[in-house]
Amino acid sequence: MAVTACQGLGFVVSLIGIAGIIAATCMDQWSTQDLYNNPVTAVFNYQGLWRSCVRESSGFTECRGYFTLLGLPAMLQAVRALMIVGIVLGAIGLLVSIFALKCIRIGSMEDSAKANMTLTSGIMFIVSGLCAIAGVSVFANMLVTNFWMSTANMYTGMGGMVQTVQTRYTFGAALFVGWVAGGLTLIGGVMMCIACRGLAPEETNYKAVSYHASGHSVAYKPGGFKASTGFGSNTKNKKIYDGGARTEDEVQSYPSKHDYV
């Protein structure tokens, strides 16, 4: 029950996170005009990953797309790439996790397969969240650098009297949405990975070992461990039966209806 709850919650948290990453990527307010200590203007500038906008006090808003690829800063391109990779991985992760949900039955899919899928989606969510956090952080760093550069030469005097006010940009709402969304996706991914450990079936069931050796019965040593999911480090562990009937490396098996005699 706890595993199902953890998996379900992980899925929901990741879903919200990925929706947030998509929203942040599409938002225009990645950077907004810094109003502090600036002359009050009737025009407010803000910029996104895909276009820049100008909102006038009259309410009129005009947005212009960046219709060039080569002319854009490499950092902006990198941020775009990170966000898109985050969205793609997150979307794939969501698809995988839907099929991995314990509460959803698909054919005769075994718990081991669901465990694998849960871990796969969990890792995808973690990477997706990290991509979003990295993208937003790179953009934020770019803003901070530009902010202090423009502050250093904010007023460039022209003949003493005439001044040009340099527009400074500060953090926009999209950055905070991106950070929170990336964090949620990351948390959701971790929850999925935790759920995966619970989903993987315990191999503590007594397996039938049917053979004769030296005319006396073979004692079964318990001390089993969780079934390998294919992603763990326990694939090389061997569960040795007295008499050396078989190892998990030779025949990796999970409890099924045929295991019980």
């Epitope: 002359p39 009050v40 025009v43 500038n45 100008v54 006038e56 009129f60 005009e62 040009t164």
Partner: antibody, heavy 118, light 113 residues
């Protein structure tokens, strides 16, 4: 067609208050910003205040908070409350509509004269 | 506050001749976000309210004759009347539409020589 009609002007003593009105037609105050601009006799234009479509306001800091701009959208009327009037406030007061894009005053009223005199 | 300085204060031009009025602002009126200049030009005839001629430094308001043109960017702007007509006798004002308060120039009186 767009029209702006100012009213409420007249002779007032220094230190007293006066409220000017500007009734608009042909457009709504929820869609356009409206300004008050004044012109002292024989002098140039001086920007007084603006109330934007959304209700935000901006003032000429030189007027030191004596003037207050407001509007009643349902009555399509703009107001300018002028307190602690001085002789230098004597002027023709115009209301003008903001054109929307690139912020310029495209339609003007005929103006109302305010004379501050003892 | 932004100071708008017009030159000359008055201008006498023969009919059909070109009239040029300059306007200088104490700070740039060019917005980096959309590369637009927030400056307007108005014409005021005696006993009348001002009339908008040019906005955005160079865009002519509808109904304004094409002999009126605006140019310039940043801090220096110009209003040109390519061929002065008798009805163009008026006072012309430039206005900062970027920084609050929206200041006007002192005005330039255009007369016929």
């Amino acid at each position: 067609q767009v029209q702006l009609v100012e009213s409420g002007g007249g002779v007032v003593q220094p230190g007293r208050s006066l409220r000017l009105s500007c009734t608009v037609s042909g457009f709504t105050l929820t869609s356009y910003g409206v300004y008050w601009v004044r012109q002292a006799p024989g002098k140039g234009l001086e920007w007084v205040a603006v109330v934007w479509a959304g209700g935000n306001t901006n003032y000429n800091s030189a007027l030191k908070g004596r003037f207050t701009i407001s509007k009643d959208n349902s009555k399509s009327t703009l107001y300018l409350q002028m307190n602690s009037l001085r002789a230098e406030d004597t002027a023709v007061y115009y209301c003008a509509r903001d054109r929307g894009r690139l912020l310029a005053m495209d339609y003007w009223g005929q103006g109302t004269l305010v004379t501050v005199s003892s | 506050d932004i100071v708008m300085t017009q030159s000359p204060d008055s201008l006498a031009v023969s009919l059909g001749e070109r009239a040029t009025i300059n306007c200088k602002s104490s700070q740039s009126l060019l917005n980096s976000g959309n590369q637009k200049n927030y400056l307007a030009w108005y014409q005021q005839k005696p006993g009348q309210p001002p009339k908008l001629l040019i906005y955005g430094a160079s865009t002519r308001e509808s109904g304004v004759p094409d002999r009126f043109s605006g140019s310039g960017s940043g801090t220096d702007f110009t209003l040109t009347i390519s061929s002065l007509q008798a009805e163009d006798v008026a006072v012309y004002y430039c206005q900062n539409d970027y920084f609050f308060p929206f200041t006007f120039g002192q005005g330039t009186k255009v007369e016929i020589k």
